[in-house]
């Protein structure tokens, strides 16, 4: 947020940039939380724009019985590993095809025991306030589907008739990690010393980090003809004086007609 300064007063302005603002030779360059000619004003809204998507990662282990382990499979750059990765990925894409949040799989390690496949199942969903529930549901479906396929696709008489066969007892879910996104916490952090006065309100499922000085929200402070200004003690209305009136009161809702006051003073003189 920048405010340009023209004229002789600029040199004086340079030394007066407030709240960590820096002079660039023409204007005060204000940190995120401030604006104004001297960076003296606190912004009324902070962009905490949620990520477009939220991700989850499930650490799984399955045992593939239709492939015999060979030393080449330890080397991730070998042709054998690459071929196994392609077939395993294709198989998992089929297994999880009905899950809209499914992105893919990432093999982390192959080890002996037929072939024990340590891998991550990657999930992603569009950000909504309900993203945790969406991803929790998706992880449950992943568990169901992998349990089902590793129970059904098994070797019969040492032969597999599917793309891959599995050991029913070799399927384990080690860990589930969901990217954490907490708009309330982000809002508080970014508002720094004004954190007590900034809140998150939702519009079209998008979170907005706002102070009561931001108009159009349920927490918005109505200063009438005055101006809402944030201070360390909270939002305050700075009341204006017009040609005809003085305004006062907590929300500048009390107007005093100047002519009455002047008339009153004039009467006293």
């Amino acid at each position: 947020r920048t405010t340009t300064c023209f004229g002789d007063g600029c040199q004086n302005t340079a030394s007066r940039c407030k709240n960590g603002g820096t002079w660039d030779g023409l204007k005060c360059q204000c940190p995120n939380l401030y604006y104004g000619e001297l960076c003296e004003e606190v912004v009324s809204s902070i962009d905490i724009g949620p990520p477009e998507t939220i991700s989850a990662q499930m650490e799984l282990t399955v045992t593939v019985t239709s492939v015999k382990f060979t030393e080449e499979l330890k080397n991730h750059s070998s042709q054998e590993f690459q071929e196994f990765k392609q077939t395993f990925t294709e198989q998992m894409n089929i297994v999880y095809s009905g899950i809209p949040e499914y992105v893919g799989v990432n093999i982390t390690k192959l080890r002996l025991g037929s072939v024990v496949v340590e891998h991550d199942v990657l999930l992603r969903t569009k950000y909504t306030p309900e993203y945790k529930t969406v991803l929790d549901n998706a992880t449950e479906v992943v568990k169901e589907k992998i349990t089902k396929v590793t129970t059904q696709q098994i070797m019969i008489n040492d032969i597999c008739s599917d793309m891959m066969c599995f050991n029913t007892t070799g399927t384990q879910v080690q860990n589930i990690t969901v990217t954490q996104y907490d708009p309330e916490e982000d809002c508080r952090k970014m508002a720094k010393e004004y954190g007590d006065y900034f809140v998150v309100e939702y519009r079209d499922q998008k979170p907005y980090c706002i102070s009561p000085c931001e108009p159009g929200f349920s927490v918005s402070k109505n200063c009438n003809l005055g101006k809402c200004q944030m201070s360390l003690s909270g939002p305050q209305c700075l009341c204006v004086t017009t040609e005809t009136h003085w305004y006062s009161g907590e929300t500048c809702n009390q107007g005093t007609q100047k002519s009455l006051v002047y008339g009153h003073h004039h009467h006293h003189h």
Partner: nanobody, 123 residues
Framework: EVQLVESGGGLVQPGGSLRLSCAAS????????MAWFRQAPGKEREGVAF???????SYAESVKGRFTISRDNAKNSLYLQMNSLRAEDTAVYYC?????????????????WGQGTMVTVSS
Amino acid sequence: EVQLVESGGGLVQPGGSLRLSCAASGFPSSRGTMAWFRQAPGKEREGVAFINSDGRTSYAESVKGRFTISRDNAKNSLYLQMNSLRAEDTAVYYCAASLLYLMTVNAAAYPYWGQGTMVTVSS
């Protein structure tokens, strides 16, 4: 680049024999798995037989005792000796390969394929 080229197909009478060959280039035939598949008109591709790098073999029930799969690592070749042929053996026969030691007769597990050779059993 892996290339598999089949040969040896043709017309044969019921009860007769044929030997199919598959020449593999760019594929280390001493490794992984090589297999024969077949596809009859209007039917799905099915596994006939496969052989692993250590010589382990497996056959479909319908060809057991009649067909023999073998590989010659020195010549980088795969063979299928077919005896006592029947009308139901009529199909296009494909050679397939994988660098992995596979124990599956599912076509989706094999990334490398030949163009196929036609075998017709008819009197």
